[in-house]
């Protein structure tokens, strides 16, 4: 119910979170769960817990396996796991695909390429960035804030892209790279004032208390490469990442189609385990780009399990 | 929807001992821990302790861990708060509650409707 | 165990004033709950997590403070903000309450 998979390379720093959420005051405690042994918490190890988080610096083959957190609220534990896998850095320029993390689209008007998991480390700008292996240069390439801008993009843009970054630990610097794909959608077209497809306006869903449950924001901007378009949720007018219910994600990226010729974006909302609260929350499927924004609300219901007689 | 719903009050003798019920509905009654919380005129509110329904587990005030005991059905999604060893100290409105977000610690957001225990001879 | 203390322990207000009530903690808290409670009902959350609004609460009221000194504002007082509020730390066990204020309407 609570574990997460991470995975990094020897010699990297990695960072993982914990799984399972608690006020930033709560105590938590790292345990490696084969031995039961406890993750120290002082900064000179070189695997060490420090809250929330769990920080290989650098990480190694051996560190490999589930790791237990324990959130210490007032009243009771609450326990999570995070799965690590360490892997050997590879000889050549092929990044396998385990070490990929979710494959973005971008077009000839909107090619940002997001670093993975950046958000977890202390680094500083400017990023850099690999195709295949090779050190992007020229003009058409900006490395701006956590993500890679490529100007007048075309299909041949396609491929693997790597960000390197330096996280740095009490003066100590540390290499971390994540690779994920890019894809490019190529085609001449127009934009117009953004058409939610999914869900319709004001559309009650029904769901299961106690099961999983998906909502796909869809909207459509018009026809071929659009430029500045987005979709994105919110719950109560509050934005995914900062409500602060870790049951309640949005899908990483956004997925991009193409519907009878127009460009199209989709934005999965998933509820984990939902729970009665859930029902007396607003979700909101917002669509915008340059034209404007356009918003469909959506509530959920509660739907019965049928009862199966035998 | 959430409901906590409470049994009846109570007219107990001194010395005795009454349980009093909490059945939940509209959630996953494993999923949360449920607290119960003692209110009278001269001591306000006091938190008693607190269950967690999956495991059994419990945490008590101090105060009245010779007072009480939490236990919890899951069968019937039903939690209970025996009170033991009544004196007149002991009358009072005896609440169910939980918390909105279980691992948020986020107040009490679901209280019943309360149960009134008369302690008197 | 954490000691809350409330004050004032009564108060009165005229519609439209602007009404301030404290809740001192004996040690640091991380976070202040505040509770409503009217005669013959149960407390209703009101206030979480120091200034978050609880559904249906009226946006005229509003909660700050940190370590050990809290409060709960009303910015314009209407004749149904008349109850007793009780604030409330879930820093550490025991969870622990105010005594509570009670607020009149003048």
């Known amino acids: 119910k609570f574990s997460k998979q991470s995975w990094g390379l020897e010699n990297e720093a990695l960072i993982v979170r914990c799984p399972r959420q608690g006020k930033p005051s709560y105590t938590v405690d790292w345990y490696y769960s084969q031995t039961n042994k406890s993750i120290p918490t002082q900064e000179r190890n070189r695997v060490f817990a420090s809250g929330q988080l769990l920080k290989f610096l650098p990480a190694a083959v051996a560190d490999s396996g589930i790791y237990t957190c324990i959130v210490r609220s007032p009243t009771f534990n609450r326990t999570g796991y995070a799965n690590v896998t360490i892997y050997k850095k590879q000889s050549d320029c092929n990044v396998p695909d385990y070490l990929m993390y979710s494959t973005v689209s971008g077009s000839e008007k909107n090619s940002k390429i997001y670093c993975p998991t950046i958000d977890l480390y202390n680094w500083t700008a400017p990023l850099e960035w690999f195709k295949n292996c090779q050190a992007l240069q020229g003009s058409r390439y900006r490395a701006h804030k956590s993500f890679l801008v490529i100007d007048n993009v075309m299909t041949e843009d396609a491929g693997d892209y790597t960000c390197k970054f330096i996280h740095n630990e009490n003066g100590a610097n540390y290499s971390v790279t994540a690779t994920r794909s890019f894809t490019v959608k190529d085609e001449q077209g127009f934009s117009l004032f953004p058409v939610i497809g999914a869900p319709a306006q004001n559309e009650i869903k029904e769901v299961e208390i106690g099961k999983n449950a998906n909502l796909t924001c869809s909207a459509c901007f018009g026809k071929g490469t659009q430029f500045l378009a987005a979709v994105l949720w919110q719950l109560n007018g509050t934005k995914i990442t900062d409500f602060g219910e870790p049951r309640i994600q949005q899908e990483e990226g956004q997925n991009q189609s193409f519907s009878n010729g127009l460009a199209c974006l989709d934005m999965v909302l998933r509820i984990a385990d939902v729970k009665e609260e859930d029902l007396l929350l607003q979700y909101d499927c917002l669509a915008l780009n340059l034209h404007g924004l356009r918003r469909h609300t959506v509530r959920l219901s509660r739907k019965n399990p049928i009862d199966h007689h035998s | 929807q959430v409901q906590l719903q409470q049994s009846g009050a109570e007219l107990v003798r001194p010395g005795a001992s009454v349980t009093l019920s909490c059945k939940a509905s509209g959630y996953t009654f494993t999923d949360y821990e449920l607290h119960w919380v003692k209110q009278t005129p001269v001591h306000g509110l006091e938190w008693i302790g607190t269950?967690?329904?999956?495991?059994?587990?419990?945490v008590y005030n101090q105060k009245f861990k010779a007072k009480a005991i939490l236990t919890a059905d899951k069968s019937s999604s039903t939690a209970y708060m025996e009170f033991r060893s009544l004196t007149s100290e002991d009358s009072a409105v005896c609440y169910c509650?939980?918390?909105?977000?279980?691992?948020?610690?986020?107040?009490?957001?679901?209280w019943g409707q309360g149960t009134l225990v008369t302690v008197s001879a | 165990q954490i000691v809350m203390t409330q004050t004032p322990a009564i108060m009165s207000a005229s519609p439209g004033e602007k009404v301030t009530m404290t809740c001192s903690v004996s040690?640091?808290?991380?976070?202040m709950h505040w509770y409503q409670q009217k005669s013959g009902t149960s407390p209703k959350r009101w206030i979480y997590?120091?200034?978050k609004l609880a559904s249906g609460v009226p946006a005229r009221f509003s909660g700050s403070g940190s370590g050990t000194s809290y409060s709960l504002t009303i910015n314009n007082m209407e004749a149904e903000d008349a109850a007793t509020y009780y604030c409330?730390?879930?820093?550490?066990?025991?969870?622990?309450f105010g005594a509570g204020t009670k607020l009149e309407l003048k």
């Open positions: 509650t939980r918390a909105f977000y279980n691992d948020y610690d986020d107040g009490f957001a679901y």
């Open positions: 997590d120091t200034s």
């Open positions: 409330q730390q879930w820093n550490s066990s025991p969870l622990t």
């Open positions: 040690s640091s808290v991380s976070y």
């Open positions: 269950i967690d329904p999956e495991t059994g587990d419990t």
